[in-house]
Each structure stands twice: as C-alpha cells, then as structure tokens.
C-alpha cells in the first residue's frame, strides 16, 4: 500500500494523532495516539 | 451504500438568499469534510468552500467570503450552503463533495436559477 | 488561493490520437492533484487522483504524471467515448479546479 502524508488541508483532521494518506485506497486515514480511538482519534478511552 | 442527497431545484429572485441541503446515509458526516462545488450553465467548476463538522471549523474561497455560510447538522447528518445576495451570475448547479475518509464523492447536485 | 493554469481550453484529436492536456500550479502542490471527466449533463466523474492514480473501473489509456507545480494528464489513444471536458483539481491548500479542457473529435 502506497502511503504518504496528508495534505496541508487535513492539518487538524486527526484530532489525537498523525494523518497519512493511503493513496491506494484514496482516503486519509489517522493514526491515533495511544489513548485515542475513532475514526478521527476524537475519542479518548482509559 | 453511501449516499449524498442533496434538495430540489430553488427559483429565486435577485437579492434573496438560498439555503441548499445535503444529507449524508450511509458513514457520519463528522468523519469528514464537506466540500460545496458550483457550475453555472455552460461554465468550469469553481469550489466555494468547506466545513469540518467535527470542528465546526469552515473555510470559504476568497470571493465568497461575506456571502456563503456552510453549516452542518451532525444530528441529522446534513450539511447545509448558504448563498445570499443573489443575482443572475449565482445561477448554477450546487454540488455537495465529501472528502476526507474517501476522495471526493459527490451528491447529484441542486440547480438554482436566479432570475427576476 | 492556489491559481491552476490548464491547457488548452479545448482541442480536437482524431480516434486513436495521443492527447495531452497540461496543469500549471501557482505553487508547489506536492502532487496532491486530480482528474475529472464530465460529459454534457452530468457530475464530474473523477479519472485520477494524487498525480497517477487511476481510479477503479477507469482505463488504462488515462494517465497523469508531474510534480512541484507542472502536471499533466494523458490519454494514450483517444477513443468515442472520451468526448467529454475535463479538469485537474489541486487539493494540496483547500481547492482550486483548472479552467477545464473540451476535447473533440476531429
């Protein structure tokens, strides 16, 4: 799978975590930070 | 299967204002964000603007500005583009895009004719 | 706003011709463009995304390729069903589409 950054329009998608593009598969995808779940690490869990 | 569906055709008079919807089936909008895109008959694509609906955060193409409010109803899952001051170069086809989770889907489109 | 020169406006080409239809960016786009085809009454069906990255279902006779500011879409053999007019997009900073092209049949 191709993978790159996202572009400078997704600064701020990933709430908790790093925005990468899959090229591949045409869409952002966020890594979230450990703690962080959903699919823009908007959500925090203990 | 994700869909956008977007309101019927609008006829309005010179000066009034315009609200287009689009609702969102099938993911949640606020994974996303949502971009608006016109036409006007016989003419190229011009993007007008966006809105994250997690943040409610917007941004407007520069001409815009002052005239277009893009909103989203994450209750509902529905996006809204407001156009106001209207006059006959406004006449177009209002598209709805998502992006973000997946490049670039779009609604069917809503034509608005402005026209006294 | 990121300005996207495209050209030309409009070209006609025989069945089987090579066309080329170029993309200038004001700005470095870091490849984070797109292609679309759009046929008279309908929305605009995207081809091609982050330079060359041909779509599902799409041909293998469109291509793109470019960086920095200069990109360009190809179709290798210009068949019927490609009459159509057809934009780049550059999604790098917001969106900004190109001018588009009409392409003919000559």
């Known amino acids: 799978v191709s993978i790159t950054k996202c572009n400078s329009d997704m600064n701020g998608y990933c709430l908790h975590g790093q925005c990468i593009y899959l090229v591949d598969m045409s869409q952002n995808y966020c890594r979230c930070e450990v703690g962080y779940t959903g699919v823009r690490c908007e959500h925090f869990y203990l | 299967q994700d869909q956008l569906v977007q309101s019927g055709a609008e006829v309005k008079k010179p000066g009034a204002s315009v609200k287009v919807s689009c609702k969102a089936s099938g993911f949640n909008i606020k994974d996303t964000y949502i971009q608006w895109v016109r036409q006007a008959p016989g003419q190229g694509l011009e993007w007008m603007g966006r809105i994250d609906p997690l943040r409610r955060n917007t941004k407007y193409r520069e001409k815009f500005e002052g005239r277009v409010t893009i909103t989203a109803d994450t209750s509902t899952n529905t996006a809204y583009m407001e156009l106001s001051s209207l006059r006959s170069e406004d006449t177009a086809v209002y598209y709805c895009?998502?992006?973000?989770?997946?490049?670039?889907?779009w609604g069917q489109g809503t034509l608005v004719t402005v026209s006294s | 706003d990121i300005q996207m020169t495209q050209s030309p406006s409009s070209l006609s080409a025989s069945v089987g011709d090579r066309v080329t239809i170029t993309c200038k960016a004001s700005?470095?786009?870091?490849?984070?463009i797109a292609w679309y085809q759009q046929k008279p009454g309908q929305a605009p069906r995207l081809l091609i995304q982050y330079t060359s990255t041909l779509q599902p279902g799409v041909p293998s006779r469109f291509s793109g390729s470019g960086s920095g500011t200069d990109y360009t879409f190809t179709i290798s053999s210009l068949q019927p069903e490609d009459i159509a007019t057809y934009y780049c997009?550059?999604?790098?900073?917001?969106?900004?589409f190109g001018g588009g092209t009409k392409v003919e049949i000559k």
């Open positions: 997009l550059q999604y790098d900073n917001l969106r900004t």
């Open positions: 700005q470095d786009i870091h490849k984070y």
């Open positions: 895009v998502r992006s973000g989770t997946l490049f670039d889907f």
